[in-house]
Amino acid sequence: QLPPGKPEIFKCRSPNKETFTCWWRPGTDGGLPTNYSLTYHREGETLMHECPDYITGGPNSCHFGKQYTSMWRTYIMMVNATNQMGSSFSDELYVDVTYIVQPDPPLELAVEVKQPEDRKPYLWIKWSPPTLIDLKTGWFTLLYEIRLKPEKAAEWEIHFAGQQTEFKILSLHPGQKYLVQVRCKPDHGYWSAWSPATFIQIPSDFTMND
């Protein structure tokens, strides 16, 4: 029977900069029941606070709801593991909410085959940013990535769309049914999950671009 091993806070994520959650990995338990507590203070403060919500984020997590989340202040946090034989602390972790945003997937993905008379046909893909992300404030720059593949293919073809919310693809296999998905990330944040797939049938007379 031993004191617990050192825990590690390894992940923090915010869906929209208004709330966030951090997760830790327990160290060894020393063969005894172990209690974990996360304490934090914000830059410029000395007063330590305990995690406001150990439930919402699941096991070994701390969730900071709206009233506990500030974009203006860096959070300094650590996890304490305690059993009957003693305690151990994680390293201190510094968190700036700006840099942990992982948005929801983009919305309203629309895919259409366009066949203009005077130009080569193309696949036109359009989407909207996730609702929880406020792009009007200006500090949020969302970047987008599209992936598509014929229904029975194993490999995805990936296209980086930058900040655009629409994209054209010229090279497609005629007569195939394609799956199309899109995801987004803030410049210094994390990729969202892929949006639900949209299916599109490419007409047999679709001319491949050379």
Epitope: E43, W72, Y94, Y99, T137, W139
Partner: antibody
Amino acid sequence: EVQLVQSGAEVKKPGSSVKVSCKASGYTFTSYWIHWVRQAPGQGLEWIGEIDPSDSYTNYNQKFKGRVTITVDKSTSTAYMELSSLRSEDTAVYYCARSFFTNWFAYWGQGTLVTVSS
Amino acid sequence: DIVMTQTPLSLSVTPGQPASISCRSSQSLVHSNGNTYLHWYLQKPGQSPQLLIYKVSNRFSGVPDRFSGSGSGTDFTLKISRVEAEDVGVYYCSQSTHVPFTFGGGTKVEIK
């Protein structure tokens, strides 16, 4: 204990490439961005670029774009910085550095001296 | 790119005396999220840089309270209230509000 251990000194010919490694330990490698910064002899610090090891997303200083490639090998918790078309002005100590969930550098490697000379 | 200008270039200080380093940026360092990402690093002789102050005025873990940072917008100052022998080295200000991140030219602090 967080450690960033870099590869040894290199001497290179003008026009060639160099690949410097930075092996991370003491934390979950994919959690935090790795940055590369260089320091020419007797000079100040210059930021080269950064990588998010979780998905290999990179941002580069435009000054080095096209000449620099930053990559990671998650299986060995190692970041790499490759600089091509070397010239004498690239002679410098190259540092890797790690952020937290922030954009400043909390931990630094010991540095790797790259000398470009004919 | 944002140009960071540090003054003075070098500073010779008697132990126990204060020291002050100025850093000026060519553009405001206020991020569109409201934060100011101006930091101070110290590079001791023969060592890698180490973080002293983050976001203008916050001491990093383990940094003695004789170090303090202040300023806003484009003008920033690092103060050492009582210089000690272990404080010798080159001090750099750095901004990470705008990409590419940039550093000042450095201020060398030595003991008289």
